[in-house]
Amino acid sequence: EVEKTACPSGKKAREIDESLIFYKKWELEACVDAALLATQMDRVNAIPFTYEQLDVLKHKLDELYPQGYPESVIQHLGYLFLKMSPEDIRKWNVTSLETLKALLEVNKGHEMSPQVATLIDRFVKGRGQLDKDTLDTLTAFYPGYLCSLSPEELSSVPPSSIWAVRPQDLDTCDPRQLDVLYPKARLAFQNMNGSEYFVKIQSFLGGAPTEDLKALSQQNVSMDLATFMKLRTDAVLPLTVAEVQKLLGPHVEGLKAEERHRPVRDWILRQRQDDLDTLGLGLQGGIPNGYLVLDLSMQEALS
């Protein structure tokens, strides 16, 4: 807090310029008109003020706009944005994608800060849904953004926005998130032909049900092992040996290296050893010949 003192004669700022770096903090407080500052915020971003001087300027804006800054000021905050608290940002109404981009640019190269998280939350809530342009912007700055959302939040993503998603944007998504995203991706890419469809849908397959995996196995997709290992265990278990062989194509040989890891391990336990032997990979742990497999869950459902 800077003490309230009168501005010395001849020091009243007529514009925001480099001469202000020579003002002491109390002089900035006394001699810079807050309304002038608000209209010339873009200039602050070109002047090498110290952090302490920026604190004074922020204080002046806070006094001028106790209910929250207007978007015309927010768009030009630059570094001053990083001095805002989440509480400050919750008072804002940010509707322009240009404003969002300008503020994300300030934080570029850093982790998502609480300020940025609050800003994004305010922006998305204001828009009502995560439209394609917003998602494009957010994932460009923060590839992990999508996976930071809850399944409930992801449900507001329209299928058309899925086109903006890159494989690396899904790297940290868990199965619950992929369960929400997969049906949207399936809808978004439904008009593509077989091989093109598979390229686009591949990153989302961690949310695919058994019937979709069975359908893919009929299309010579040659799924790689990394993708297979990310599939839902409950979706993989009902697949037959023949279906997995078709699904993986030449990559089927990789099953041997993964036989102790889920979902391969659990899938092996559900297959007849005879069928596994047809792969010629030496996979062990299948159901021995002559054993009858009862699906108790099915039996319970019937009773």
């Epitope: 002047i47 090498p48 003020f49 630059g78 001053l80 640019e105």
Partner: nanobody, 115 residues
Framework: LQLVESGGGLVQPGGSLRLSCAAS????????IGWFRQAPGKEREGVSS????????NYADSVKGRFTVSRDNAKHTVYLQMNSLKPEDTAVYYC??????????MGQGTSVTVS
Amino acid sequence: LQLVESGGGLVQPGGSLRLSCAASGFTLDNYAIGWFRQAPGKEREGVSSISSSGGSTNYADSVKGRFTVSRDNAKHTVYLQMNSLKPEDTAVYYCVGVGDYGRRAMGQGTSVTVS
């Protein structure tokens, strides 16, 4: 973003020093730079500034005619040439940079003693 100042030291009244400000991990070329100083027990004060192109410079009244700010973008360095030094110039000198989107960088300072 970190700036590194150097060139400080002990000098007699009337003597000269040249301070340097360089960037660590990025390039200063598109950064406007301000030089500040802080004497013991006093508020930090602005000394001079230079635009990113070097075409515009400003000075505090107390150093006008004695200090000169310049930049060598080929060496990614900004200089503060201090002549006719006085005991009241004794302080820790800092450089502050501002780049695209108002991104800031500041150094740890270099100490100047005029005695």
